[in-house]
Interface confidence: low
């Protein structure tokens, strides 16, 4: 929506004659009729599709026109339009002589025309006036014109509606091209989103007005980056809300129970090692020769049963001595003297003699390990599954459970992202390392070729009554060139009455 403005400045008719050459009596009382229409290569009669306007009598013969209201008429003359400005136009300006006060076309003599000019061309929207002068053999007209947008309309064609606002629905003013310009402290497509206090945590904080930082439940602090621990948490902290992770030495649901009894009370005697094991609970690990809850009782050396594998203990003045049963030796009878004859290999392991029978080694079957084949092998310890697959033990074998997008025994194969034909409108799919890419055919764009990029505004045949459709010069809109007898932006209205002015 906009206005074509025409400012008449000076009209010269020194001899005071009509177009026919006949003089006006007593002088040429001059008024103007203006017709604005769609672009025509050769301006021809027909409906003024963009509008018409006429003036009262502005002067006699030669005169200057004041640039304000004059005798009830307006200067500049206003020709409003409520469609997208097409960028081209045709303009007809006629000067007429009014013998009397009735300026209606039917009240004037047929030869009352003083002069007529017709121009056409391109005209961009803008504040600057185009100054022009048109001279004929007997007259000269100086005038200027421009196209400006109506209030709240912007852009090269006055097609963008934008109304500044500062309320719940948006906080913005309008730029010259009609795009929104957010007021300070606001962002988003319609400037509805406040810009929070600088540093306000993205997930844990929010704001309802600029420079604010309101915390979501479970968070606190100026920037909402400190979690709130469980209510009543005494000696603990949190890394996520409502946790109570106890400081060292404290326990219980609220970290209010003292667990560091060892440090505070030193209950273990005779050089024993103290271990905390709960609230007011501890364990003393006694040195050899001591026993009791706090290792407060002295033992004989053999009271601690130091001899292993069934060895018997003998107290001695300087300690103790172990008498080992057959097949064992060492200070505590801890070493075996078994051989392959004693069948030491478990789970079907094969025994091999070493050092002339003084020792042996077990060769284990699959899935077992250890010096006596006593341990079951975990086949997943080597992390055989690629691309984040999960390893599962399945009896004598293992298997990999793959993440989405991968397959194969060890999840080593990448499933093709193109297999599901994700590219729309005949786009070509290319597998990439981290996803896919679509190559779009002409007329489409977007990550999946889902966006139609070129539109022929005339393709939908918007013009009625056999009118000719032209695509606009600068936007994907249309202009209808109406045949004689029809008007309107789509040539949809028949002219029921004779036209107001005989163009």
């Amino acid at each position: 929506s906009g206005v074509f403005q025409l400012q008449l400045q000076e009209f010269i008719n020194e001899r005071g004659v009509l177009a026919s050459g006949r003089p006006c009596e007593p002088g040429c009382r001059t008024f103007f009729r203006v017709c604005l229409k769609h672009f025509q290569a050769v301006v021809s009669p027909g409906p003024c599709t963009f509008g018409t306007v006429s003036t009262p009598v502005l002067g006699t013969n030669s005169f200057a026109v004041r640039d304000d209201s004059s005798g009830g008429g307006r200067n500049p003359l206003q020709l409003p339009f409520n469609f997208t400005w097409p960028g081209t136009f045709s303009l007809i300006i006629e000067a007429w002589h009014a013998p009397g006060d009735d300026l209606r076309p039917e009240a004037l003599p047929p030869d009352a025309l003083i002069s007529k000019i017709a121009i056409q061309g391109s005209l961009a929207v803008g504040q600057n006036w185009l100054l022009d002068e048109q001279t004929s053999t007997l007259t000269r007209l100086r005038y200027s014109y421009r196209v400006i947008c109506s209030d709240n309309y912007y852009g090269d064609n006055c097609s963008r509606l934008c109304k500044k606002r500062n309320d719940h629905f948006g906080h913005y003013v309008c730029q010259p091209d009609g795009n929104l310009s957010c007021l300070p402290g606001w962002t988003g497509e319609y400037c509805q989103q406040p810009i929070c206090l600088s540093g306000c945590h993205e997930q844990n904080g929010y704001c309802s007005k600029p420079a604010e930082c309101l915390c979501r439940p479970g968070w606190q602090g100026r920037l909402c980056n400190e979690c709130i621990p469980h209510n009543g948490c005494r000696h603990g902290t949190c890394s996520t809300p409502w946790q109570c992770t106890c400081d060292e030495g404290w326990g219980g649901l609220f970290c209010d129970q003292d667990l560091n009894y060892c440090t505070h009370h030193s209950p273990c005697k005779n050089g024993a090692t103290c271990s905390n094991s709960g609230q007011r609970s501890y364990t003393c690990t006694c040195r050899p020769g001591y026993t009791g809850v706090d290792c407060e009782l002295e033992l004989s050396e053999c009271d601690s049963n130091p001899c292993r594998n069934g060895g018997s203990c003998k107290d001695q003045e300087d300690g103790y001595h172990c008498l080992c049963p057959p097949g064992y030796y060492g200070l505590h009878c801890e070493h075996s003297t078994l051989s392959c004859a004693d069948s030491p290999c478990f789970n079907g392991g094969s025994c091999r003699e070493r050092n002339q029978g003084a020792n042996y080694a077990c060769e284990c079957p699959p899935n077992f390990t250890g010096s006596n084949c006593e341990k079951k092998v975990d086949r997943c310890t080597s992390n055989p599954c690629a691309n984040g697959g999960q390893c599962l033990n399945r009896g004598p074998s293992r298997m990999c459970r793959c993440r989405p997008g991968f397959t194969g025994t060890y999840c080593e194969l990448h499933v093709s992202d193109c297999a599901r034909n994700p590219c729309a409108h005949g786009g070509t799919c290319h597998d990439l390392e981290n996803g896919l890419m679509c190559t779009c055919p002409a007329g489409f764009s977007g990550r999946r070729c889902e966006v139609r990029t070129s539109i022929d505004a005339c393709a939908s045949s918007p013009c009625f009554n056999r009118a000719t459709c032209y695509t606009d010069l600068s936007t994907d809109t249309f202009v209808c060139n109406c045949p004689y007898g029809f008007v309107g932006s789509r040539c949809e209205f028949p002219v029921g009455l004779p036209p107001s002015f005989p163009w």
């Epitope: 960028g87 056409q120 061309g121 391109s122 022009d132 048109q134």
Partner: nanobody
Framework: EVQLVESGGGLVQAGGSLRLSCAAA????????MGWYRQAPGKQRELVAH???????YYADSVKGRFTISRDNAKNTMYLQMNSLKPEDTAVYYC??????????WGQGTQVTVSS
């Protein structure tokens, strides 16, 4: 006063191409709206294409997609690239310019003949 000189016309077979040039003598070429018109024998002169001071282009339906109008303000020259020529494109092609769309200036014309 503005002088316009067209060149580049000639005889070409249907489906061929030609490039017309229009050189303008005048220091304010960039502020002129430029256009190409043509007149076939026994017919009215018709608009082919025009280009605004900002480079906005307009084409007659009969040449859309085949002809391309352009201007080089540094060389004070306007061009018309004509592809996929048809016998019905045969005409005298005129270069036209307007200062503020009122003062009309025309070149002398260049003949384009398309044989079938």
């Amino acid at each position: 006063e503005v002088q316009l000189v067209e060149s580049g016309g000639g005889l070409v077979q249907a489906g061929g191409s030609l490039r017309l040039s229009c050189a303008a003598a005048g220091s304010t070429f960039s502020s002129y709206v430029m256009g190409w018109y043509r007149q076939a024998p026994g017919k009215q002169r018709e608009l082919v294409a025009h280009i605004s001071t900002r480079g906005i282009t307009y084409y007659a339906d009969s040449v859309k997609g085949r002809f391309t109008i352009s201007r080089d303000n540094a060389k004070n020259t306007m061009y018309l690239q004509m592809n996929s020529l048809k016998p019905e494109d045969t005409a005298v092609y005129y270069c036209n310019t307007r200062r503020n769309f009122l003062s009309n200036y025309w070149g002398q014309g260049t003949q384009v003949t398309v044989s079938s």
